[in-house]
C-alpha cells in the first residue's frame, strides 16, 4: 500500500494509472466503501462522501490512462485509505494528513515561549524536527517548545514531519515582537538636544497599544514617569508628560522622543515599556543618558560626566594637539592652573571617543570662553 503524506489546508493528488492509455471506467472510494468520484465517459460524477466539494480529478489526463484523485483544503480527518478501481484492478493509497500550528499566535513577545503542536491522524507515530531561523534544531513528538524567544528567532521556522520513511515539510513564520536594541546609550554635552529612538524589530499592519517611559536620574532617589502615550494603528498620541523635563514625542513610528536639552540632573537611565493590544506582557527597551560638562572656575579646569558609565571608560583632559594632561577611569577630572588654549574633555572607550567637549582657556587676566 502506497503512503502519501499531506498538509492540513493544502491540496494532495493521489495517482491512479490504468494499463490502457485511454479514458476508461474508474472510480475512487474510501475505506468505508463510499464513492468519492468516478467517471461517466468524459464526465466526472461525484459520490456522497464528505469530501464532495473538495474532491476533484483531472479530466485532461483520463485519455492517458491517469485518473487522479485531488483533495483540496485537506483536513486531518481526510486521513484514510483511498481505493481507486480501474479496469479489474484496485490501487490503494494511504493518506496521512498532518497539521502544525503555533500555540496561540505566531506573533510573540521577546522572552515568551513558542509551542508548536502537531495534529496527526489516529494511529500515526510521527517525529518532528524544527529548525529556527538562527539554525537551532529542536526535536519532539506531538509538541515542541522553545522558551525565552530571542529576536533572532524571528523568521521562518522549517519543520519536518517524518512518518513511514516519508516526510512532509511545514514552514511557519514567527514574528518576535521586540525593540531592535535591548539597550542604548546616548552621550551628550550639557545643553545639547537629546534624541531617543526606539525602533521596533518587526512590522505589522496595525499596531495598537500604550507605552510609558520611566526615568531614574542618577541624582534622584526614585524613578519617575516622564511620559505616557497611546499607539493606535501606528499613530502616536501623548497622554501625559512631565513639566520638567518636557519631552516631545513624534507622531509616527519609530517611537521618537526629544529632550530639549541635556542637563546633569537628567543623566541616568530610563525604561520604555510598550504594551501591545491583545498581547500579555510588554516590550522593554533600556535607554541611558550620559551628560558631560566642562567648566573653568578660577584656576581649576574641570570635566565631569553624569549618568551610567562603565568602569572601563576613560575621561581625559588635554590641550589641543597635545598629550592628555590627565586621564582617569573616573567621572571627574581636573587640571589646576591650565595653560591658555583650547582644551578638550574626552570620554573614550578603548581609544574610541564617545563624547567630547571643548573649552577655551584664556590667559590668566581674562575669563574663560566656552564655545
Amino acid at each position: 500500500k502506497k503512503v502519501v503524506l499531506g498538509k492540513k489546508g493544502d491540496t494532495v493528488e493521489l495517482t491512479c494509472t490504468a494499463s490502457q492509455k485511454k479514458s476508461i471506467q474508474f472510480h475512487w472510494k474510501n475505506s468505508n466503501q463510499i464513492k468519492i468520484l468516478g467517471n461517466q465517459g468524459s464526465f466526472l460524477t461525484k459520490g456522497p462522501s464528505k469530501l464532495n466539494d473538495r474532491a476533484d480529478s483531472r479530466r485532461s489526463l483520463w485519455d492517458q490512462g491517469n485518473f487522479p484523485l485531488i483533495i483540496k483544503n485537506l483536513k486531518i480527518e481526510d486521513s484514510d485509505t483511498y481505493i481507486c478501481e480501474v479496469e479489474d484492478q484496485k490501487e490503494e493509497v494511504q493518506l496521512l494528513v498532518f497539521g502544525l500550528t503555533a500555540n496561540s499566535d505566531t506573533h510573540l513577545l521577546q522572552g515568551q515561549s513558542l509551542t508548536l503542536t502537531l495534529e496527526s491522524p489516529p494511529g500515526s507515530s510521527p517525529s518532528v524536527q524544527c529548525r529556527s531561523p538562527r539554525g537551532k534544531n529542536i526535536q519532539g513528538g506531538k509538541t515542541l517548545s522553545v522558551s525565552q524567544l530571542e529576536l533572532q528567532d524571528s523568521g521562518t521556522w522549517t519543520c519536518t514531519v517524518l512518518q513511514n520513511q516519508k516526510k512532509v515539510e511545514f514552514k511557519i513564520d514567527i514574528v518576535v515582537l521586540a525593540f531592535q536594541k535591548a539597550s542604548s546609550i546616548v552621550y551628550k554635552k550639557e545643553g545639547e538636544q537629546v534624541e531617543f529612538s526606539f525602533p521596533l524589530a518587526f512590522t505589522v499592519e496595525k499596531l495598537t497599544g500604550s507605552g510609558e517611559l520611566w526615568w531614574q536620574a542618577e541624582r534622584a532617589s526614585s524613578s519617575k514617569s516622564w511620559i505616557t502615550f497611546d499607539l493606535k494603528n501606528k499613530e502616536v498620541s501623548v497622554k501625559r508628560v512631565t513639566q520638567d523635563p518636557k519631552l516631545q514625542m513624534g507622531k509616527k513610528l519609530p517611537l521618537h522622543l526629544t529632550l530639549p536639552q541635556a542637563l546633569p540632573q537628567y543623566a541616568g537611565s530610563g525604561n520604555l515599556t510598550l504594551a501591545l493590544e491583545a498581547k500579555t506582557g510588554k516590550l522593554h527597551q533600556e535607554v541611558n543618558l550620559v551628560v558631560m560638562r566642562a567648566t573653568q572656575l578660577q584656576k581649576n579646569l574641570t570635566c565631569e560626566v553624569w549618568g551610567p558609565t562603565s568602569p572601563k571608560l576613560m575621561l581625559s583632559l588635554k590641550l589641543e594637539n597635545k598629550e592628555a594632561k590627565v586621564s582617569k577611569r573616573e567621572k571627574a577630572v581636573w587640571v589646576l592652573n591650565p595653560e591658555a588654549g583650547m582644551w578638550q574633555c574626552l570620554l573614550s572607550d578603548s581609544g574610541q571617543v564617545l563624547l567630547e567637549s571643548n573649552i577655551k582657556v584664556l590667559p590668566t587676566w581674562s575669563t574663560p570662553v566656552q564655545p
Epitope: 476508461i24 471506467q25 472510480h27 472510494k29 466503501q33 464513492k35 468516478g38 461517466q40 465517459g41 468524459s42 464526465f43 466526472l44 460524477t45 461525484k46 459520490g47 456522497p48 464532495n52 479530466r59 478501481e85 480501474v86 479496469e87 479489474d88 484496485k90
Partner: antibody
Framework: MVHLQESEPELVKPGASVKMSCKAS????????INWVKQRTGQGLEWIGE????????YYNEKFKDKATLTVDKASNIAYMQLSSLTSEDSAVYFC???????????WGQGTLVTVSA | DIVLTQSPASLAVSLGQRATISCKAS??????????MNWYQQKPGQPPKLLIY???NLESGIPARFTGSGSGTDFTLNIHPVEEEDTATYYC????????TFAGGTNLEIK
C-alpha cells in the same frame, strides 16, 4: 446497437425477496456503469444505485441501501438487483439504465414491474 | 441531496407554439465548464428517453425542436414548434453528484 433487456414482471408476497436482471448487449459491458431507477405508478423517478461493472463495486442511494443489492456477472454481461423484505411501497417499475457519451441516462431497459401483494 | 424543482407541473400548448419548462436546483450543478443537467421525455408504459444532456447538448436522434439552456441552478427546456407526439411527461435530472435526482415532472398536453 446498445440494448438493455430486463427480466419479466414479478408478483411477490410481502416480506419476500425478488431478484431481477438486466442483460446488456451491443457494447463492451465493463466499459459502462449500470444504474437502477425506481418508478411507482403515476410517480416520479428515483435513483436506487449503480454498479461499476469493471470492478463489481456498487454504490447506493442512502434510501435504498438496506433494500437493494446490486451485483454483476461479467462473464454473461448481466447486472442484477435483488430487493428484500418487500412491502407494498416496493410495488413499482424498476429500470436499469446506462449513460451515453454524456451525463444523462441514454439507454434504458424496458422496465420490470414488481407487484407486492398478499 | 440536490433537490430539483420543476415548473409548471402541467402545461397545455397549442400545436406549433412554444413550450417552456423550467428547472431549479437547490445548489449549482456546474463543474469544470459543464452543467450536469439532463432532460427526459416519458410516455405512458415506456422508459424515459434522454433528450438533452449537459444542459444544452442534443442527444443523437432527438429533433432540433428540443433545446436546453441554463447553468448553475436555473435551467430551461424549450420545445418549438410543439407537435402532437410531444404529449408526454418531461423530467429534469442532475448528475452532478450522487444520488442523481429527478424533479417531479411536467405534463405537457398539446391543444
Amino acid at each position: 446497437m446498445v440494448h438493455l433487456q430486463e427480466s419479466e414482471p414479478e408478483l411477490v408476497k410481502p416480506g419476500a425477496s425478488v431478484k431481477m436482471s438486466c442483460k446488456a448487449s451491443g457494447y463492451t459491458f465493463t466499459d459502462y456503469v449500470i444504474n437502477w431507477v425506481k418508478q411507482r405508478t403515476g410517480q416520479g423517478l428515483e435513483w436506487i444505485g449503480e454498479t461499476y461493472t469493471g470492478s463489481g463495486s456498487s454504490y447506493y442511494n442512502e434510501k435504498f441501501k438496506d433494500k437493494a443489492t446490486l451485483t454483476v456477472d461479467k462473464a454473461s454481461n448481466i447486472a442484477y438487483m435483488q430487493l428484500s423484505s418487500l412491502t407494498s411501497e416496493d410495488s413499482a417499475v424498476y429500470f436499469c439504465a446506462r449513460r451515453g457519451k454524456g451525463t444523462g441516462f441514454a439507454f434504458w431497459g424496458q422496465g420490470t414491474l414488481v407487484t407486492v401483494s398478499a | 441531496d440536490i433537490v430539483l424543482t420543476q415548473s409548471p407541473a402541467s402545461l397545455a400548448v397549442s400545436l406549433g407554439q412554444r413550450a417552456t419548462i423550467s428547472c431549479k436546483a437547490s445548489q449549482s450543478v456546474d463543474y469544470d465548464g459543464d452543467s450536469y443537467m439532463n432532460w427526459y421525455q416519458q410516455k405512458p408504459g415506456q422508459p424515459p428517453k434522454l433528450l438533452i444532456y449537459a444542459a444544452s447538448n442534443l442527444e443523437s436522434g432527438i429533433p432540433a425542436r428540443f433545446t436546453g439552456s441554463g447553468s448553475g441552478t436555473d435551467f430551461t427546456l424549450n420545445i418549438h414548434p410543439v407537435e402532437e407526439e410531444d404529449t408526454a411527461t418531461y423530467y429534469c435530472q442532475q448528475s452532478y453528484e450522487d444520488p442523481p435526482t429527478f424533479a417531479g415532472g411536467t405534463n405537457l398536453e398539446i391543444k
